[in-house]
């Protein structure tokens, strides 16, 4: 059986939309499937790599690599999207390409970044971990770390940094899929909202879905002990 909830929820574009949340109900009247997984149920994607989920994550990453920061022209906010999802008339799509990106580093002026920009994250304004020396952030936003400390400045002069961020990674469903969403939408969908991250590639949704002890490598499920738990 399914339990359907419908509600008006604030979505990425800053408007309220009617959203459906469909929850698979437990036939035996008990915890939901997500709760059972958290409690240690035999759920194979938590025990070993699941090809379907792996393909989903890779697909999400490929899309994210090509994303940019969509900044609303009315200064109402910004969100990481694909170009096609960013209004050409109501917003500005900040995407580095050709020769428009910043240099990889102050020591390497010739090599330009082509991957990015990312809403509220920039190698030029992140103090920790700083992009410098042997630790220059790669020219692939899906390999960027979470910035834990921004440079202390009210404004940077960069559109993608001075805007109010409207969406962050949200881990939704037992399949460990990730979407950049508003906090409201994420909570309504019973997802896990990552306030600290800017990109889906920075979070490991399956690790969150599975719970219990974190995976040794967040990309490789290793909870073999589930076989004895349930």
């Amino acid at each position: 059986a399914q339990h359907v909830t419908t509600q008006l929820v604030l979505r990425n574009k800053g408007v309220y939309e009617s959203v459906k949340y469909i929850q698979q109900e437990n036939f035996w009247i008990g915890p939901s499937s997500i709760d059972l997984i958290h409690l240690g149920a035999k759920f194979s994607p938590c025990i070993r790599k699941d090809q379907q989920i792996e393909q989903l994550v890779l697909r999400e990453r490929d899309l994210e690599r090509d994303s940019g920061c969509c900044v609303q022209n009315d200064h109402s906010g910004c969100i990481q999207t694909q170009r096609k999802d960013c209004s050409e008339t109501l917003a500005t799509f900040v995407k580095w390409q050709d020769d428009t990106g910043p240099p990889m580093d102050k020591s390497d002026l010739g090599q330009k970044r082509t991957s990015g920009a990312v809403c509220h994250q920039d190698p030029r304004t992140c103090e920790e971990p700083a992009s410098s020396g042997a630790h220059i952030w790669p020219d692939d936003i899906t390999k960027w770390p979470i910035c834990t400390e921004q440079a202390k400045s009210n404004r940077t002069g960069f559109l993608h940094m001075d805007c109010q961020i409207k969406g962050r990674p949200c881990c939704i469903s037992t399949k460990g899929s990730c979407e950049i969403t508003t906090r409201e939408y994420c909570e309504f969908m019973h997802g896990y909202f990552h306030e600290e991250a800017t990109l889906c590639s920075q979070v490991h949704c399956l690790d969150k879905v599975c719970g219990l002890l974190p995976f040794l490598n967040p990309e490789v499920p290793d909870q073999f002990y589930r076989l004895w738990l349930s």
């Epitope: 428009t100 240099p103 002026l109 330009k112 103090e127 440079a151 202390k152 940077t156 002069g157």
Partner: antibody, heavy 123, light 106 residues
């Protein structure tokens, strides 16, 4: 308000070492992303970049002069220094220090300049 | 190193006249930066990233260009615009400036 002020010996003889100081206020060189550079201008001529130093002590020099230049900083005193070894009459110029900014820029630019100090190399 | 060639070396304009000066790079650069220097004063930044106006710079100044060819335009010349203008690149070390264009008031 950001200000920079250069000071130097005014006059010195060939083969000596020129020592320049740039004292600044309104910003700190310990701030992430901050930099200060030296640029010189011989009388009636154009501008020539000499060197610059960043908050993380990263230093960059004009290769044509690198063997003679040394840039350093004293963050606590809000000062940077430039030494030019073995000066010649061709080194006579007005020396400017300038803050490096990247506000809104994909690269950087010299956004605030000092008033300059004139140095004459003469025997 | 990247050599920046400015032209003309000297030019004059009457008040209200439109003025355009150019800066040619010996190899392609991503962006150009422009500075103004009045006699007896320090340079000040006018334009960054080819076309962005620096803080406090009058809107009659504008910059454009790409690759190896860049220009600075004053839409309506004013007496206070009489100065020497330098272009500068930050595309590769050493950082280089053009020799300057001296703009005089007619």
């Amino acid at each position: 308000q950001v200000t920079l002020k250069e000071s130097g010996p005014g006059i010195l003889q060939p083969s000596q070492t020129l020592s320049l100081t740039c004292s600044f206020s309104g910003f700190s060189l310990s701030t992430f992303g901050m930099g200060v550079g030296w640029i010189r201008q011989p009388s009636g001529k154009g501008l020539e970049w000499l060197a610059h130093i960043w908050w993380d002590d990263d230093k960059y020099y004009n290769p044509a002069l690198k063997s003679r230049l040394t840039i350093s900083k004293d963050t606590s005193k809000n000062q940077i220094f430039l030494k030019i070894a073995n000066v010649d009459t061709a080194d006579s110029a007005t020396f400017y220090c300038a803050r490096i900014e990247n506000y809104g820029s994909n690269y950087w630019y010299f956004d605030v300049w000092g008033t300059g100090t004139t140095v004459t190399v003469s025997s | 190193q990247i050599v920046l060639t400015q032209s003309p070396a000297i030019m004059s304009a009457s008040p209200g006249e439109k003025v355009t000066m150019t800066c040619s790079a010996s190899s392609s650069v991503s962006y150009m930066y422009w500075y103004q220097q009045k006699p007896g004063s320090s340079p000040r930044v006018l334009i960054y990233d080819t076309s962005n106006l620096a803080s406090g710079v009058p809107v009659r100044f504008s910059g454009s260009g790409s690759g190896t060819s860049y220009s600075l335009t004053v839409s309506r010349m004013e007496a206070e615009d009489a100065a020497t203008y330098y272009c500068q690149q930050w595309n590769s070390y050493p950082l280089t400036f053009g020799a300057g264009t001296k703009l005089e008031l007619k």
